[in-house]
Structures are given as structure tokens and as C-alpha cells.
Interface confidence: medium
Amino acid sequence: ESALITQQDLAPQQRAAPQQKRSSPSEGLCPPGHHISEDGRDCISCKYGQDYSTHWNDLLFCLRCTRCDSGEVELSPCTTTRNTVCQCEEGTFREEDSPEMCRKCRTGCPRGMVKVGDCTPWSDIECVHKESGTKHSGEVPAVEETVTSSPGTPASPCSLSG
């Protein structure tokens, strides 16, 4: 896992409540599951289910947990050291080029092509030409051109959020 942080990820700063665990920074950094206090003297724990941090940091805030969108399923909940893992529902997928939404997988390949890859949460079905074996990357074919197939079962998580 890794951590590029964006504006929406930052949780509103809150004063450390009495129940929040504190520890001392190491080399000016706080461990995963914590953020640093404004004066830099303490590491303050993130709040389980609300925010998190994944690496050693000098963040003034923990990062706000992601909420899975409709059309997604939650594979694992947010902890203090790991963000929520969301995955597209069966029959839909998320492309790297358009990570903001899950798109419906095609139901089949155009005529003259064969399916060589199932629908997964991170990729559409894969079609190749029967003769040449070259991949098809066109638009969704018309219904009468399709050979129907059922979506594949997810094999591993497609997490955009840690």
C-alpha cells in the first residue's frame, strides 16, 4: 500500500479526546494509526472506523475513511491503519483511466470474436478475433451481435482507497 493524499481525504482536525492514546514521535514521525500533534510532541491515535494513517507520518490529521459508493461492496472495513477496501459489484468493473465509477461489463463479444477473459471488478470481458487473436477494444456491441456470458467471480480486491 501507499499514500497519496488529497483534499477530500483529510479529516477535520479535532482536539485529542482523553481516550485517545498518545505516544512520542520517533525522529519527528508518528507510526501508522496515528498523527502528530500541533506542537510536534505527541502522536495521537486515529479513531477506529472514522480515520486512519497507513505509514510513518507527520500528518496533522488522520485521513478520513472512504465510504463505499452505491454499486460497490465493502470488502474490508476502515481501521486506524488501513482505509476501507471497496470493490465494484459483480458484473461491473472500474478502469484505471476512470476510477470514479463502476461501469457495466459487456455481456458478450462481437461476432467473429471469442471471449478469453471474464468480467472482473477491475476489467471488462476480454475478446479476441478468432483468427488473428488480436484484442478487441471497441464499444459495447449491439445485442444481436453478442454471445452472452456470465460475469466472472472476483478473485482479488480492486481498492482505490488503500
Epitope: 497519496l4 488529497t6 500528518l59
Partner: nanobody
Framework: EVQLLESGGGLVQPGGSLRLSCAAS????????MGWFRQAPGKEREFVSA????????YYADSVKGRFTISRDNSKNTLYLQMNSLRAEDTAVYYC??????????????????WGQGTLVTVS
Amino acid sequence: EVQLLESGGGLVQPGGSLRLSCAASGRSISNYAMGWFRQAPGKEREFVSASVWNNGGNYYADSVKGRFTISRDNSKNTLYLQMNSLRAEDTAVYYCVVARTPETPITSARGANYWGQGTLVTVS
């Protein structure tokens, strides 16, 4: 479209220092998360460090904690990585990355939207 140009790589002895720079063109970087990843020969690309635009803090991989420092100069549209106490295992191509939009949560190398061409750091 954002262009990222890394510089500062080279050959250095163990225990030495280098400072990498990443100059961004095409837009201001001030509202965007940026970071560094690296890829050693025959290994997967891995996270090194990330910077939040508003001085909210920085992130570091365990392997570089206390040795590397990330910083940015928004007026120069440049991200830096100061690397001290370099080790042989730090040998890799170092890539600068930037988020595509301020709203997009990007937390994996696979999701980082804009990548530089990389600069080679050899510790030997």
C-alpha cells in the same frame, strides 16, 4: 496535461546523499497530492514518500523513515526528495507522481495518475 521531469539521480557511495527534484509543468501543483515511488531491478514499484499540498504533513515508507525527507516549493512547481544515509537497497529508478484531480483519492502506485519518466539512483 501534466508533465513531470525528475532530476538529481546518479551514482553515490553508501552513506552518501542525493537530492531529487521533480519539476511539474502544465498546471500548478499547490492543490494536489504528490509523491515518490521507486522500482528496483526485478522488483515491484513501491511507495517511498508523499506530500500533502497544504503543509498538513508527509508520509514515509518504513524503509526510508528518518533518512529521506520530502518537500515541495509550490512557487517553483517543484517537489523534492532529500535522501541521506543511502544504502545499496535504495538503488532504483525513482518516479515522481501527482494526483489527477484534488478530489480523486489516490493511494496506490496503480492509481497514481501522472508519472514522470524516472531518474536512476545507484548506491554502490
